[in-house]
């Protein structure tokens, strides 16, 4: 029967007793930077080309016995998971292996850098189709390794890496912390985060998604027909590399941003038990398990968005946090979140010719996060309209006044340390959906975009009694672009998007009291692109 | 890649040359920074990646590496250029004493220097 991991990544419409993906990734080349491999294993023989690249440190210990099967173990298994005939994800993908890890599975940042440079030079000498680079390794945070990954990604290469097996914040490791890399955590057959001895999968905002990574059957270097189960975030990353190869084979023109958005979009949502993660990391960790798209074509009509969390600002009074979208993405909205509730909101601002989302800490606050909603919106022209604090009882409001521009997100930012909770709640006048409304002491920022066929609507969900969490979701066919709270009072910890749902978090009910001041409204801006839908119909 | 770097592996004699002058001193106010792994057991002191500014050409990378060797030799230190980077990042990989870091950070075109560190199969 089909191994659990292949079943898990297969959409229901393909599920049978066997794993039969629609396309095997045959147009894609996957580079593997790992240990040496047993290239004559029946799973991968003829599919994996061993390059002459080798840059590894000597093994530790004077009595180390170099046994070929042990030296090849990690890399052979991963090559099998990516493209193995029996147990591979992308059975049609061809691979090239570079040896950057020694027989003990240890390498160096410098060796990995030279390996990445080798790939870039190979790409320049002999351009082929789409390239995926699998980095099933991790070291401490490295500015230079992250920089090299960024350069390679900007040269059109898709990099997939292991989040790390340290049961820790993936942002503390490289290349897991590189924003341009697709970073993968590991889950098991029960869709739970993988525990590995006393440690386990890494987590946090630097993880893009999770994938099967426990008890994964694959080629064993013990013998040319042997199979073995292995576990780790490397195995998880290999699944995503395989899925990426298949998606790129079906749509070779996909950019890294488009591929990442699709990987997120087609993932299984909210299946991971977040209690496994440290409490402060739960909100930052994506609850996504990778899966193949139900059909390899026709996804182009959708408006894809993802949520990007910033690093924590730190607790100093004037501390700020910045969340950025990828170069090919549009920042459609910006929100902020603080566990203590002490924040001074957020604003969208231009930085290096691109909009970023900046959140502001408040005096006595433990720090804030900026949360960017990053979307794929071709031919978009977006700008930010700002209204300074109104000081009028009606509150501050701003709208998109340019012809053809629609509201995609609202942000509010205030200079005062504390927005009083005694102010009456501000309600948006009906019939004015293209308008952001906020507290009278706050400046309000509207994200206004023009793109062919783009239409947006505002959806609200208000709860009169205080609740720790208020949510509002966009319906089928619409994509959440903006998420904010009404009113911007101090008991609101912040707002953020989780998939297609806008979440507004408030202080613990017990500390708020049940007066009308506790009323919270979650405001979602839901958009869709008729232009993308038409374009996709024309293609079909 | 060793052949490629063979030219730089010999000890450079401490001869005064235009290479060793201050003709290309770093621009005022831009100080190169040093980075190392926060996890101590994973550090590999003695090997450093010298990253040069983005638009630096290969010939400038080679020249900067030679200059470092020359200046180190004059101070009695042996250095070995293990690799010259180009294609992704401009720079070079050097085996040298940590005592030379201050000197290396002052070289022209240097953006930052990172001490090598270990990575592990996951």
């Amino acid at each position: 029967s089909i191994p659990w991991n292949l079943e898990r990544i297969t959409p229901p419409r393909y599920r049978a007793d066997e794993y039969q993906p629609p396309d095997g990734g045959s147009l894609v080349e996957v580079y593997l930077l790992d240990t040496s491999i047993q290239s004559d294993h029946r799973e991968i023989e003829g599919r994996v080309m061993v390059t002459d690249f080798e840059n590894v440190p000597e093994e530790d210990g004077t009595r180390f016995h170099r046994q070929a099967s042990k030296c090849d173990s990690h890399g052979t298994h991963l090559a099998g998971v990516v493209s193995g005939r029996d147990a591979g994800v992308a059975k049609g993908a061809s691979m090239r292996s570079l040896r950057v890890l020694n027989c003990q599975g240890k390498g160096t940042v410098s060796g990995t850098l030279i390996g990445l440079e080798f790939i870039r030079k190979s790409q320049l000498v002999q351009p082929v189709g789409p390239l995926v680079v699998l980095l099933p390794l991790a070291g401490g945070y490295s500015r230079v390794l992250n920089a090299a990954c960024q350069r390679l990604a900007r040269a059109g290469v898709v990099l997939v890496t292991a989040a790390g097996n340290f049961r820790d914040d993936a942002c503390l490791y490289s290349p897991a912390s590189a924003p341009e890399v697709i970073t993968v955590g590991a889950t098991n057959a029960q869709d739970q985060p993988v525990t590995l001895g006393t440690l386990g999968t890494n987590f946090g905002r630097c993880v893009d998604l999770f994938a099967p990574g426990e008890d994964i059957i694959g080629a064993s270097s013990d013998c040319s027909t042997c199979f073995v189960s292995q576990s780790g975030t490397s195995q998880a990353a290999a699944h995503v590399a395989g899925i990426a190869a298949m998606m790129l084979s079906a749509e070779p023109e996909l950019t890294l941003a488009e591929l990442r958005q699709r990987l997120i979009h087609f993932s299984a949502k909210d299946v991971i038990n977040e209690a496994w993660f440290p409490e402060d990391q739960r909100v930052l960790t994506p609850n996504l398990v990778a899966a193949l798209p139900p059909s390899t074509h026709g996804a182009g009509w959708q408006l894809f968005c993802r949520t990007v969390w910033s690093a924590h600002s730190g607790p100093t009074r004037m501390a700020t946090a910045v969340a950025r979208c990828a170069p090919d993405e549009e920042l459609l909205s910006c929100s902020s979140f603080s566990r203590s509730g002490k924040r001074r909101g957020e604003r969208m601002e231009a930085q290096g010719g691109k909009l970023v989302c900046r959140a502001h800490n408040a005096f006595g606050g433990e720090g804030v996060y900026a949360i960017a909603r990053c979307c794929l919106l071709p031919q978009a022209n977006c700008s930010v309209h700002t209204a300074p604090p109104a000081e009028a009882s009606m509150g501050t409001r701003v709208h998109c006044h340019q012809q053809g521009h629609v509201l995609t997100g609202c942000s509010s930012h205030w200079e005062v340390e504390d927005l009083g909770t005694h102010k009456p709640p501000v309600l948006r006048p009906r019939g004015q959906p293209n308008q952001c409304v906020g507290h009278r002491e706050a400046s309000i920022h509207a994200s206004c975009c023009h793109a062919p066929g783009l239409e947006c609507k505002v959806k609200e969900h208000g709860i009169p009694a205080p609740q720790e969490q208020v949510t509002v979701a966009c319906e089928e066919g619409w994509t959440l672009t903006g998420c904010s709270a009404l009113p911007g009072t101090s008991h609101v910890l912040g707002a953020y998007a989780v998939d297609n749902t806008c979440v507004v978090r408030s202080r613990d009910v017990s500390t708020t009291g049940s007066t009308s001041e506790g009323a919270v409204t979650a405001v979602a801006i839901c958009c869709r692109s008729r232009h993308l839908a038409q374009a996709s119909q024309e293609l079909q | 890649q060793e052949d490629e770097d063979g030219d730089y592996e010999e000890l450079v004699l401490a001869l005064r040359s235009e290479e060793d002058g201050l003709a290309e001193a770093p621009e005022h106010g831009t100080t190169a920074t040093f980075h190392r792994c926060a996890k101590d057991p994973w550090r590999l002191p003695g090997t450093y990646v010298v990253v040069l500014k983005e638009e630096t050409h290969l010939s400038q990378s080679e020249r900067t590496a030679r200059r470092l060797q020359a200046q180190a030799a004059r101070r009695g230190y042996l250095t070995k250029i293990l690799h010259v980077f180009h294609g992704l990042l401009p720079g070079f990989l050097v085996k040298m004493s940590g005592d030379l870091l201050e000197l290396a950070l002052k070289l022209p075109h240097v953006d930052y220097i990172e001490e090598d560190s270990s990575v592990f199969a996951q």
């Epitope: 039969q20 029946r42 023989e45 599919r47 005939r85 040319s224 027909t225 | -």
Partner: antibody, heavy 119, light 113 residues
């Protein structure tokens, strides 16, 4: 149900060519390896070689390398064993067998094709 | 190539009695990563294709009566029929599947005494 159906018995003269077939049904033919096994009259089993129909990758026993060709047509879920020039010593029963998942041992066998080579 | 040698070549056992067949491989077929022996046993009755009985040296294939059992590790293996039945008359083959070329033992013929 899962089965392998082989082509019928063949009587051939030495020097002639021959191609026998093995059609799989009831499962995803491209995802399982097919081996060919020879059994000469009154003798034991000899593994000849294997094919993965998904990409037509083959691996032959050194004893049979160059003597026979194994191929597959995944569009009709059929594997083949062929000879370009038969010898009298090729007289035998030939079985195709499907791999068990993740191990080259054989859970499903064809009924066998008897090949007789005689002048 | 791994050479598989079976003993005895033939065996006559009374109905209800135990039959034991041995198989030796020229090199170990036990692998450390999953601690499994890559050895199988097949039964072939006259005029029929072989049938898989045991794999991983000791795992019974579904539908195989529990009077058939496999044991051994490394290079020495045994197939035991605990209580021979009339329908067990056949030739039994061991097979290693740890590496190409796959090899079979020469076969052991089991008859009723």
């Amino acid at each position: 149900q899962v089965q392998l159906v082989q082509s019928g018995a063949e009587v051939k003269k030495p020097g002639e060519s021959l191609k026998i077939s093995c059609k799989g049904s009831g499962y995803s033919f491209t995802n399982y390896w097919i081996s060919w096994v020879r059994q000469m009259p009154g003798k034991g089993l000899e593994w000849m070689g294997i094919i993965y129909p998904g990409d037509s990758y083959t691996n032959y026993s050194p004893s049979f390398q160059g003597q026979v060709t194994i191929s597959a047509d995944k569009s009709i879920s059929t594997a083949y064993l062929q000879w370009s020039s038969l010898k009298a010593s090729d007289t035998a029963m030939y079985y195709c067998a499907r791999d068990y998942a993740y191990k080259p041992l054989f859970d499903i066998w064809g009924q066998g094709t008897l090949v007789t080579v005689s002048s | 190539d791994i050479v598989m040698t079976q003993s005895p070549d033939s065996l006559a056992v009374s109905l209800g009695e135990r039959a034991t067949i041995n198989c030796r491989s020229s090199q170990s077929v036990l692998y450390s990563s999953n601690n499994k022996n890559y050895l199988a046993w097949y039964q072939q009755k006259p005029g029929q294709p072989p049938k898989l009985l045991i794999y991983w040296a000791s795992t019974r294939e579904s539908g195989v009566p529990d009077r058939f059992s496999g044991s051994g590790s490394g290079t020495d293996f045994t197939l035991t029929i605990s209580s021979l039945q009339a329908e067990d008359v056949a030739v039994y083959y061991c097979q290693q599947y740890s590496s190409f070329p796959i090899t079979f033992g020469q076969g052991t013929k089991v008859e009723i005494k």
